[in-house]
Amino acid sequence: VQNSCDNCQPGTFCRKYNPVCKSCPPSTFSSIGGQPNCNICRVCAGYFRFKKFCSSTHNAECECIEGFHCLGPQCTRCEKDCRPGQELTKQGCKTCSLGTFNDQNGTGVCRPWTNCSLDGRSVLKTGTTEKDVVCGPPVVSFSPSTTISVTPEGGPGGHSLQVL
Protein backbone atom coordinates (compact mmCIF):
# COMPACT_ATOMS: atom_id res chain seq x y z
CA VAL A 1 0.00 0.00 0.00
CA GLN A 2 1.45 3.36 -1.02
CA ASN A 3 2.22 5.69 1.87
CA SER A 4 0.24 8.92 1.37
CA CYS A 5 3.26 10.85 2.70
CA ASP A 6 4.79 10.26 -0.74
CA ASN A 7 2.36 12.78 -2.22
CA CYS A 8 3.37 15.61 0.11
CA GLN A 9 4.78 18.75 -1.50
CA PRO A 10 7.95 20.62 -0.51
CA GLY A 11 7.18 22.95 2.40
CA THR A 12 5.39 20.20 4.29
CA PHE A 13 6.20 17.32 6.63
CA CYS A 14 4.42 14.06 7.22
CA ARG A 15 4.56 11.38 9.93
CA LYS A 16 3.91 7.79 8.85
CA TYR A 17 1.72 6.99 11.86
CA ASN A 18 -0.54 9.93 10.88
CA PRO A 19 0.06 10.34 7.15
CA VAL A 20 -1.24 13.89 6.68
CA CYS A 21 0.79 16.58 4.90
CA LYS A 22 1.30 19.48 7.33
CA SER A 23 2.89 22.84 6.56
CA CYS A 24 6.35 23.45 7.96
CA PRO A 25 6.22 25.70 11.04
CA PRO A 26 7.73 29.20 10.73
CA SER A 27 11.55 29.31 10.58
CA THR A 28 11.69 25.76 9.22
CA PHE A 29 11.73 24.37 5.68
CA SER A 30 11.61 21.17 3.66
CA SER A 31 12.85 21.14 0.10
CA ILE A 32 11.58 17.56 -0.30
CA GLY A 33 8.00 16.66 0.60
CA GLY A 34 7.06 13.72 2.80
CA GLN A 35 9.92 14.01 5.29
CA PRO A 36 9.01 13.36 8.95
CA ASN A 37 10.45 16.74 10.02
CA CYS A 38 11.17 20.14 8.58
CA ASN A 39 14.70 21.51 8.89
CA ILE A 40 15.55 24.57 10.98
CA CYS A 41 16.30 27.62 8.87
CA ARG A 42 19.81 28.99 8.72
CA VAL A 43 20.30 32.42 10.29
CA CYS A 44 22.53 35.07 8.68
CA ALA A 45 23.81 37.64 11.18
CA GLY A 46 27.05 39.03 12.57
CA TYR A 47 29.64 38.66 9.81
CA PHE A 48 26.97 37.03 7.63
CA ARG A 49 24.06 38.66 5.83
CA PHE A 50 21.18 37.22 3.84
CA LYS A 51 21.57 36.42 0.17
CA LYS A 52 18.28 34.53 0.28
CA PHE A 53 15.72 34.39 3.07
CA CYS A 54 14.39 31.10 4.36
CA SER A 55 11.03 30.00 3.01
CA SER A 56 8.97 26.90 3.69
CA THR A 57 10.61 25.23 0.68
CA HIS A 58 14.24 26.42 0.76
CA ASN A 59 16.87 27.28 3.34
CA ALA A 60 18.38 30.73 3.72
CA GLU A 61 21.60 31.50 1.88
CA CYS A 62 24.22 33.67 3.54
CA GLU A 63 27.06 35.79 2.24
CA CYS A 64 29.70 37.74 4.14
CA ILE A 65 29.40 41.42 4.98
CA GLU A 66 31.57 43.92 3.11
CA GLY A 67 35.29 43.53 3.80
CA PHE A 68 34.93 39.76 4.30
CA HIS A 69 34.65 36.77 1.98
CA CYS A 70 33.12 33.32 2.28
CA LEU A 71 35.01 30.14 3.07
CA GLY A 72 33.74 26.57 2.92
CA PRO A 73 30.75 25.09 1.13
CA GLN A 74 27.60 27.23 1.41
CA CYS A 75 29.65 30.02 3.00
CA THR A 76 30.16 28.41 6.41
CA ARG A 77 32.79 30.92 7.51
CA CYS A 78 33.68 34.54 6.87
CA GLU A 79 37.29 35.65 6.64
CA LYS A 80 38.66 39.16 6.32
CA ASP A 81 39.39 40.10 2.72
CA CYS A 82 42.93 39.49 1.54
CA ARG A 83 45.39 42.37 1.63
CA PRO A 84 47.59 43.43 -1.27
CA GLY A 85 50.44 40.91 -1.47
CA GLN A 86 48.02 38.02 -0.86
CA GLU A 87 45.59 35.91 -2.85
CA LEU A 88 42.53 33.94 -1.84
CA THR A 89 42.93 30.15 -1.91
CA LYS A 90 40.68 27.37 -0.60
CA GLN A 91 42.71 27.54 2.60
CA GLY A 92 42.18 31.31 2.95
CA CYS A 93 44.52 34.24 2.27
CA LYS A 94 48.04 33.24 1.24
CA THR A 95 51.06 35.48 0.67
CA CYS A 96 52.17 35.70 -2.95
CA SER A 97 55.14 33.45 -3.69
CA LEU A 98 58.50 34.94 -4.70
CA GLY A 99 58.36 36.41 -8.19
CA THR A 100 54.62 37.13 -8.04
CA PHE A 101 52.52 40.06 -6.82
CA ASN A 102 48.93 41.22 -6.22
CA ASP A 103 48.31 44.96 -5.90
CA GLN A 104 44.55 44.65 -5.31
CA ASN A 105 42.69 44.87 -2.04
CA GLY A 106 40.30 41.98 -1.33
CA THR A 107 40.36 40.50 -4.83
CA GLY A 108 42.68 39.30 -7.56
CA VAL A 109 45.33 36.63 -7.86
CA CYS A 110 49.11 36.73 -7.60
CA ARG A 111 50.59 37.39 -11.04
CA PRO A 112 54.20 36.93 -12.15
CA TRP A 113 56.43 39.98 -12.17
CA THR A 114 57.02 41.50 -15.59
CA ASN A 115 60.05 39.99 -17.29
CA CYS A 116 61.85 43.17 -18.33
CA SER A 117 64.46 41.31 -20.38
CA LEU A 118 61.79 40.07 -22.79
CA ASP A 119 61.36 43.69 -23.88
CA GLY A 120 65.10 44.30 -23.88
CA ARG A 121 64.82 46.43 -20.76
CA SER A 122 66.66 46.38 -17.45
CA VAL A 123 65.05 46.17 -13.99
CA LEU A 124 64.88 49.69 -12.57
CA LYS A 125 63.12 48.69 -9.35
CA THR A 126 62.73 45.18 -8.01
CA GLY A 127 59.26 43.76 -7.41
CA THR A 128 57.57 42.89 -4.11
CA THR A 129 54.54 40.73 -3.24
CA GLU A 130 52.45 43.91 -3.58
CA LYS A 131 54.10 45.61 -6.55
CA ASP A 132 55.35 44.61 -9.97
CA VAL A 133 58.95 45.29 -11.01
CA VAL A 134 59.61 48.62 -12.68
CA CYS A 135 61.42 48.21 -15.97
CA GLY A 136 64.00 50.74 -17.08
CA PRO A 137 64.46 52.17 -20.59
CA PRO A 138 65.38 49.80 -23.42
CA VAL A 139 69.01 48.60 -23.23
CA VAL A 140 70.92 49.54 -26.37
CA SER A 141 72.78 46.44 -27.51
CA PHE A 142 75.53 46.72 -30.10
CA SER A 143 76.58 44.20 -32.70
CA PRO A 144 80.37 43.71 -33.32
CA SER A 145 80.21 45.54 -36.66
CA THR A 146 78.66 48.66 -35.15
CA THR A 147 80.93 51.71 -34.90
CA ILE A 148 80.21 54.59 -32.66
CA SER A 149 81.43 58.12 -33.11
CA VAL A 150 80.75 61.03 -30.84
CA THR A 151 80.46 64.22 -32.81
CA PRO A 152 80.17 67.73 -31.45
CA GLU A 153 76.74 69.24 -31.92
CA GLY A 154 75.27 72.60 -31.09
CA GLY A 155 78.39 74.28 -29.78
CA PRO A 156 80.74 73.49 -26.96
CA GLY A 157 79.87 70.63 -24.62
CA GLY A 158 77.15 69.29 -26.88
CA HIS A 159 77.51 65.72 -28.08
CA SER A 160 75.28 63.36 -29.97
CA LEU A 161 75.53 59.62 -30.22
CA GLN A 162 75.62 58.38 -33.76
CA VAL A 163 75.31 54.70 -34.58
CA LEU A 164 76.88 54.05 -37.96
Partner: antibody, heavy 113, light 106 residues
Protein backbone atom coordinates in the same frame (compact mmCIF):
# COMPACT_ATOMS: atom_id res chain seq x y z
CA UNK B 1 25.91 55.46 -4.81
CA UNK B 2 22.99 53.05 -4.35
CA UNK B 3 19.63 54.30 -5.60
CA UNK B 4 16.22 52.78 -6.33
CA UNK B 5 13.37 54.53 -8.11
CA UNK B 6 9.82 53.30 -8.59
CA UNK B 7 7.68 54.27 -11.58
CA UNK B 8 4.15 53.44 -12.64
CA UNK B 9 0.64 54.78 -13.16
CA UNK B 10 -0.89 56.85 -10.37
CA UNK B 11 -4.43 55.70 -11.10
CA UNK B 12 -5.65 52.23 -12.09
CA UNK B 13 -9.16 50.84 -12.62
CA UNK B 14 -10.45 47.98 -10.44
CA UNK B 15 -10.05 44.49 -12.03
CA UNK B 16 -7.13 45.77 -14.13
CA UNK B 17 -3.45 44.82 -13.79
CA UNK B 18 -0.93 47.09 -12.11
CA UNK B 19 2.59 47.21 -13.55
CA UNK B 20 5.37 48.96 -11.62
CA UNK B 21 9.07 49.31 -12.41
CA UNK B 22 11.95 49.72 -9.98
CA UNK B 23 15.13 51.02 -11.61
CA UNK B 24 18.27 50.51 -9.55
CA UNK B 25 21.78 51.91 -9.71
CA UNK B 26 24.92 51.51 -7.61
CA UNK B 27 24.54 47.73 -7.32
CA UNK B 28 23.91 44.76 -9.55
CA UNK B 29 20.70 42.72 -9.67
CA UNK B 30 22.84 39.63 -10.19
CA UNK B 31 24.43 40.24 -6.76
CA UNK B 32 21.57 41.59 -4.64
CA UNK B 33 17.86 40.90 -4.44
CA UNK B 34 15.10 43.52 -4.47
CA UNK B 35 11.93 43.61 -2.36
CA UNK B 36 8.55 45.15 -3.01
CA UNK B 37 6.74 46.59 0.01
CA UNK B 38 3.49 48.52 0.12
CA UNK B 39 1.76 50.84 2.57
CA UNK B 40 -1.93 51.74 2.34
CA UNK B 41 -2.69 55.37 3.33
CA UNK B 42 -2.43 55.82 7.10
CA UNK B 43 -1.59 52.15 7.63
CA UNK B 44 1.43 49.91 8.21
CA UNK B 45 3.99 48.24 5.95
CA UNK B 46 3.26 45.02 4.07
CA UNK B 47 6.02 42.92 2.51
CA UNK B 48 4.90 41.71 -0.91
CA UNK B 49 7.83 39.68 -2.21
CA UNK B 50 11.41 39.57 -3.39
CA UNK B 51 13.36 38.66 -6.51
CA UNK B 52 16.78 37.25 -5.65
CA UNK B 53 20.21 37.60 -7.27
CA UNK B 54 19.61 34.36 -9.25
CA UNK B 55 16.11 35.32 -10.42
CA UNK B 56 14.31 33.17 -7.84
CA UNK B 57 11.32 34.69 -6.08
CA UNK B 58 9.48 34.51 -2.76
CA UNK B 59 6.00 35.98 -2.32
CA UNK B 60 3.68 36.91 0.49
CA UNK B 61 1.23 34.00 0.55
CA UNK B 62 -1.69 36.39 1.19
CA UNK B 63 -1.37 37.91 -2.30
CA UNK B 64 0.77 35.30 -4.07
CA UNK B 65 -1.96 34.26 -6.52
CA UNK B 66 -2.22 37.81 -7.97
CA UNK B 67 1.45 38.74 -7.81
CA UNK B 68 4.43 38.39 -10.12
CA UNK B 69 7.94 39.83 -9.76
CA UNK B 70 10.42 39.73 -12.64
CA UNK B 71 13.51 41.63 -13.78
CA UNK B 72 15.64 42.79 -16.69
CA UNK B 73 19.24 42.67 -15.48
CA UNK B 74 20.58 44.45 -18.59
CA UNK B 75 18.42 47.49 -17.76
CA UNK B 76 18.83 47.14 -13.96
CA UNK B 77 15.05 47.01 -13.62
CA UNK B 78 12.70 44.99 -11.42
CA UNK B 79 9.01 44.67 -12.27
CA UNK B 80 5.95 44.13 -10.10
CA UNK B 81 2.64 42.99 -11.56
CA UNK B 82 -0.59 42.65 -9.58
CA UNK B 83 -3.70 41.50 -11.38
CA UNK B 84 -7.42 41.67 -10.46
CA UNK B 85 -6.89 44.97 -8.64
CA UNK B 86 -9.23 45.95 -5.83
CA UNK B 87 -9.70 49.30 -4.10
CA UNK B 88 -7.77 47.98 -1.06
CA UNK B 89 -4.67 47.68 -3.28
CA UNK B 90 -4.49 51.49 -3.08
CA UNK B 91 -1.12 52.14 -1.44
CA UNK B 92 2.32 53.65 -1.64
CA UNK B 93 4.52 51.01 -3.31
CA UNK B 94 8.22 50.85 -2.43
CA UNK B 95 11.12 48.79 -3.70
CA UNK B 96 14.13 48.18 -1.45
CA UNK B 97 17.47 46.41 -1.66
CA UNK B 98 17.61 42.95 -0.06
CA UNK B 99 19.00 44.18 3.27
CA UNK B 100 16.41 47.00 3.46
CA UNK B 101 19.30 49.47 3.77
CA UNK B 102 18.21 51.41 0.68
CA UNK B 103 14.62 52.20 -0.32
CA UNK B 104 13.07 54.01 -3.23
CA UNK B 105 10.99 57.13 -2.60
CA UNK B 106 7.82 55.18 -3.39
CA UNK B 107 5.05 55.54 -5.95
CA UNK B 108 1.45 56.19 -4.93
CA UNK B 109 -1.09 53.99 -6.70
CA UNK B 110 -4.82 54.63 -6.40
CA UNK B 111 -7.27 51.94 -7.49
CA UNK B 112 -10.55 53.61 -8.36
CA UNK B 113 -13.12 53.75 -11.10
CA UNK C 1 3.21 33.28 9.10
CA UNK C 2 4.92 34.98 12.00
CA UNK C 3 2.72 37.73 13.46
CA UNK C 4 4.45 40.65 15.16
CA UNK C 5 2.48 42.59 17.76
CA UNK C 6 3.80 46.03 18.63
CA UNK C 7 2.92 48.04 21.71
CA UNK C 8 1.97 50.70 22.44
CA UNK C 9 0.22 51.86 19.26
CA UNK C 10 0.92 55.50 20.13
CA UNK C 11 3.12 57.10 22.75
CA UNK C 12 3.79 60.74 23.60
CA UNK C 13 7.03 61.68 25.33
CA UNK C 14 8.59 64.91 26.54
CA UNK C 15 12.11 65.87 25.45
CA UNK C 16 14.64 64.05 27.65
CA UNK C 17 12.19 61.29 28.59
CA UNK C 18 12.97 57.57 28.13
CA UNK C 19 10.79 55.59 25.71
CA UNK C 20 10.45 51.83 25.20
CA UNK C 21 8.60 50.13 22.35
CA UNK C 22 8.01 46.36 22.45
CA UNK C 23 7.48 43.80 19.72
CA UNK C 24 6.19 40.28 20.38
CA UNK C 25 6.42 37.48 17.82
CA UNK C 26 3.86 34.69 17.48
CA UNK C 27 6.75 32.23 17.25
CA UNK C 28 10.44 32.47 18.06
CA UNK C 29 12.63 34.55 15.76
CA UNK C 30 16.42 34.78 15.76
CA UNK C 31 16.78 38.54 15.34
CA UNK C 32 14.61 41.63 15.10
CA UNK C 33 14.91 44.60 12.76
CA UNK C 34 13.51 48.09 13.36
CA UNK C 35 12.62 50.95 10.99
CA UNK C 36 11.91 54.62 11.49
CA UNK C 37 9.43 56.33 9.20
CA UNK C 38 8.63 60.02 9.22
CA UNK C 39 5.49 61.44 7.60
CA UNK C 40 5.73 61.49 3.80
CA UNK C 41 9.09 59.71 3.73
CA UNK C 42 10.31 56.18 3.01
CA UNK C 43 11.13 53.96 5.99
CA UNK C 44 14.76 53.86 7.15
CA UNK C 45 16.51 50.80 8.55
CA UNK C 46 17.15 51.84 12.16
CA UNK C 47 18.31 48.76 14.08
CA UNK C 48 19.46 45.42 12.62
CA UNK C 49 20.46 42.06 14.14
CA UNK C 50 18.38 43.01 17.22
CA UNK C 51 20.86 45.48 18.71
CA UNK C 52 23.10 47.00 16.01
CA UNK C 53 22.44 50.60 15.07
CA UNK C 54 22.24 51.33 11.36
CA UNK C 55 24.55 53.95 9.89
CA UNK C 56 23.76 57.46 11.15
CA UNK C 57 21.45 56.36 13.98
CA UNK C 58 22.21 58.26 17.21
CA UNK C 59 23.41 56.11 20.12
CA UNK C 60 20.56 57.23 22.34
CA UNK C 61 18.71 54.39 20.58
CA UNK C 62 19.23 50.75 21.52
CA UNK C 63 17.67 47.39 20.74
CA UNK C 64 17.43 44.18 22.74
CA UNK C 65 15.51 40.94 23.11
CA UNK C 66 15.43 37.28 22.07
CA UNK C 67 12.97 34.52 21.20
CA UNK C 68 9.54 36.10 21.00
CA UNK C 69 10.14 39.33 22.91
CA UNK C 70 12.09 42.33 21.58
CA UNK C 71 12.28 46.01 22.33
CA UNK C 72 13.56 49.31 21.01
CA UNK C 73 14.61 51.85 23.66
CA UNK C 74 15.21 55.55 23.31
CA UNK C 75 17.26 56.84 26.21
CA UNK C 76 16.42 60.54 25.95
CA UNK C 77 13.64 61.68 23.64
CA UNK C 78 14.48 64.48 21.19
CA UNK C 79 12.11 66.33 18.87
CA UNK C 80 13.71 64.77 15.76
CA UNK C 81 12.82 61.28 17.08
CA UNK C 82 9.09 61.87 16.56
CA UNK C 83 8.16 59.24 13.94
CA UNK C 84 6.53 55.84 13.50
CA UNK C 85 8.68 52.81 14.36
CA UNK C 86 8.13 49.35 12.89
CA UNK C 87 9.63 46.01 13.91
CA UNK C 88 10.25 43.30 11.31
CA UNK C 89 11.40 39.67 11.29
CA UNK C 90 13.66 38.11 8.67
CA UNK C 91 13.62 34.56 10.08
CA UNK C 92 11.38 33.18 7.35
CA UNK C 93 9.21 34.37 4.49
CA UNK C 94 6.79 35.97 4.38
CA UNK C 95 8.84 38.67 6.06
CA UNK C 96 6.42 40.42 8.39
CA UNK C 97 6.22 43.86 9.99
CA UNK C 98 4.66 44.94 13.25
CA UNK C 99 1.72 47.32 12.98
CA UNK C 100 3.86 50.28 14.04
CA UNK C 101 4.23 52.57 17.05
CA UNK C 102 3.71 56.29 16.57
CA UNK C 103 6.05 58.28 18.81
CA UNK C 104 4.92 61.85 19.35
CA UNK C 105 6.54 64.77 21.13
CA UNK C 106 4.68 66.15 24.14
Amino acid sequence: QVQLKEAGPGLVQPTQTLSLTCTVSGFSLTSDGVHWIRQPPGKGLEWMGIIYYDGGTDYNSAIKSRLSISRDTSKSQVFLKINSLQTDDTAMYYCARIHFDYWGQGVMVTVSS
Amino acid sequence: DIVLTQSPTTIAASPGEKVTITCRASSSVSYMYWYQQKSGASPKLWIYDTSKLASGVPNRFSGSGSGTSYSLALNTMETEDAATYYCQQWSSTPLTFGSGTKLEIK
